[in-house]
C-alpha cells in the first residue's frame, strides 16, 4: 500500500489584495480514512481555514468536488484577499479517531505573501 504524501507544490504564492488566491494540495492516497483540513500557521494557535467535514467558510471554495469518492485534490480558493491573509498555509490529513480525529500528516506549507499592487 502506498504511503500517503501531502503535496503542496508552491513554496511561495504572491497574491494581490482584492483578488482570489488558489492554494494547491493533492494527496497520493485516500487511506487512512479521515478528513483533510487547511490551517494557517502551526502549533496550538494555528487558524482553521477550511474543514471538509463541517463548518462555514464563506470566503473559501474547493477547486474539486470533494464529494467524489476518489477525490485526491484538496486545493482551495480564498476570495477577496486582504493583508491580514498573509502567512503560511498547510493542508493536513487527519486519520479517524475517537473521540477526536488524529493529525496524520501535513503538507510542507505554502507561504502566501503580497505581491505588487495592481496599477
Amino acid at each position: 500500500e502506498e504511503e500517503l504524501q501531502m503535496i503542496q507544490p508552491e513554496k511561495l504564492l504572491l497574491v494581490t489584495v482584492g483578488k482570489t488566491a488558489t492554494l494547491h494540495c493533492t494527496v497520493t492516497s485516500l487511506l487512512p480514512v479521515g478528513p483533510v483540513l487547511w490551517f494557517r500557521g502551526v502549533g496550538p494557535g494555528r487558524e482553521l481555514i477550511y474543514n471538509q467535514k463541517e463548518g462555514h467558510f464563506p470566503r473559501v471554495t474547493t477547486v474539486s468536488d470533494l464529494t467524489k469518492r476518489n477525490n485526491m485534490d484538496f486545493s482551495i480558493r480564498i476570495s477577496s484577499i486582504t493583508p491580514a491573509d498573509v502567512g503560511t498555509y498547510y493542508c493536513v490529513k487527519f486519520r479517524k479517531g475517537s473521540p477526536e480525529n488524529v493529525e496524520f500528516k501535513s503538507g510542507p506549507g505554502t507561504e502566501m505573501a503580497l505581491g505588487a499592487k495592481p496599477s
Epitope: 485516500l30 487512512p32 480514512v33 470533494l66 464529494t67 467524489k68 469518492r69
Partner: antibody
Framework: DVQLVESGGGVVRPGESLRLSCAAS????????MSWVRQAPGKGLEWLAG????????YYIDSVKGRFTISRDNSKNSLYLQMNSLTAEDTAVYYC???????????WGLGTLVTVSS | ALTQPASVSANPGETVKITCSGG??????YGWYQQKSPGSAPVTVI????KRPSDIPSRFSGSASGSAATLTITGVRVEDEAVYYC???????????FGAGTTLTVL
C-alpha cells in the same frame, strides 16, 4: 427541514424498465452526494449506488452495474435511478439517502415500492 | 461483509451493546440505522463511527476500534425496539455495505 420524497415506483414485468425520482428540499442539494438504498421484502438494507454532488462520479454495487444508472439534476433538486432489465429479485422498497462527508447517510426518504412480477 | 448479531434483548433501563465486525479500521467508517418496521424509512442514529445527529437522544452512542464498531444504548426504552443496521463505507473500494440487521427486543 431536510425532506426527501421518492416517486416512480409501481408494478412492472420482468425485463421492463422503470425510472425512480427523489425530490429534495430543505438543504443545498448541489452540495451533497446522494445514494439509493433498497430493501427487498423480509430482507435487510442494500446499498445500490452513489453519486457525487456535481454528478460526474458514480459508484454501484456489482449486482446492478450495467443495469441501473444513478443521475441527478441539481437545477431541479432531483435524484434519479434508471432501472433496466428488471427481474423479480429487484422487487423492493427503494430509498434515496443524503450522504455525509464520508459517504455514510444522514437523511432518508420514505421510500417507493417497486414490484417486478409477471 | 459486515457481521452483527441477529437479535438482542434487554429490560427497560439496561444498557445494550450491538457489535458490527468485518470492516477494516484503516479504511472504513461506520454508521448505525434504526428501522422500526419493515419498509418504513430508516433513521440515522450514528454516522462517522461516533457522531450522533442532533435529534437523536443522548442514550445512543457509537464507537469503533480495530475491525469492529459498537452501538451502545444506555438506559434502553420500549420505544427503542427496532431493527438496527450497521453500515460501512470502505475508502479502499468506494463501496457501502450493510450488515444483516439486529432485532432489539425490549422485554
Amino acid at each position: 427541514d431536510v425532506q426527501l420524497v421518492e416517486s416512480g415506483g409501481g408494478v412492472v414485468r420482468p425485463g421492463e424498465s422503470l425510472r425512480l425520482s427523489c425530490a429534495a428540499s430543505g438543504f443545498t442539494f448541489s452540495s451533497y452526494a446522494m445514494s439509493w438504498v433498497r430493501q427487498a421484502p423480509g430482507k435487510g438494507l442494500e446499498w445500490l449506488a452513489g453519486i457525487s454532488a456535481g454528478g460526474s462520479d458514480a459508484y454501484y454495487i456489482d449486482s446492478v452495474k450495467g443495469r441501473f444508472t444513478i443521475s441527478r439534476d441539481n437545477s431541479k433538486n432531483s435524484l434519479y435511478l434508471q432501472m433496466n432489465s428488471l427481474t423479480a429479485e429487484d422487487t423492493a422498497v427503494y430509498y434515496c439517502a443524503r450522504e455525509t462527508w464520508n459517504h455514510l447517510f444522514d437523511y432518508w426518504g420514505l421510500g417507493t415500492l417497486v414490484t417486478v412480477s409477471s | 461483509a459486515l457481521t452483527q448479531p441477529a437479535s438482542v434483548s434487554a429490560n427497560p433501563g439496561e444498557t445494550v451493546k450491538i457489535t458490527c465486525s468485518g470492516g477494516d479500521w484503516y479504511s472504513t467508517y461506520y454508521g448505525w440505522y434504526q428501522q422500526k418496521s419493515p419498509g418504513s424509512a430508516p433513521v440515522t442514529v450514528i454516522h462517522s463511527d461516533d457522531k450522533r445527529p442532533s435529534d437523536i437522544p443522548s442514550r445512543f452512542s457509537g464507537s469503533a476500534s480495530g475491525s469492529a464498531a459498537t452501538l451502545t444504548i444506555t438506559g434502553v426504552r420500549v420505544e427503542d425496539e427496532a431493527v438496527y443496521y450497521c453500515a460501512g463505507y470502505d475508502g479502499r473500494t468506494y463501496i457501502n455495505t450493510f450488515g444483516a440487521g439486529t432485532t432489539l427486543t425490549v422485554l
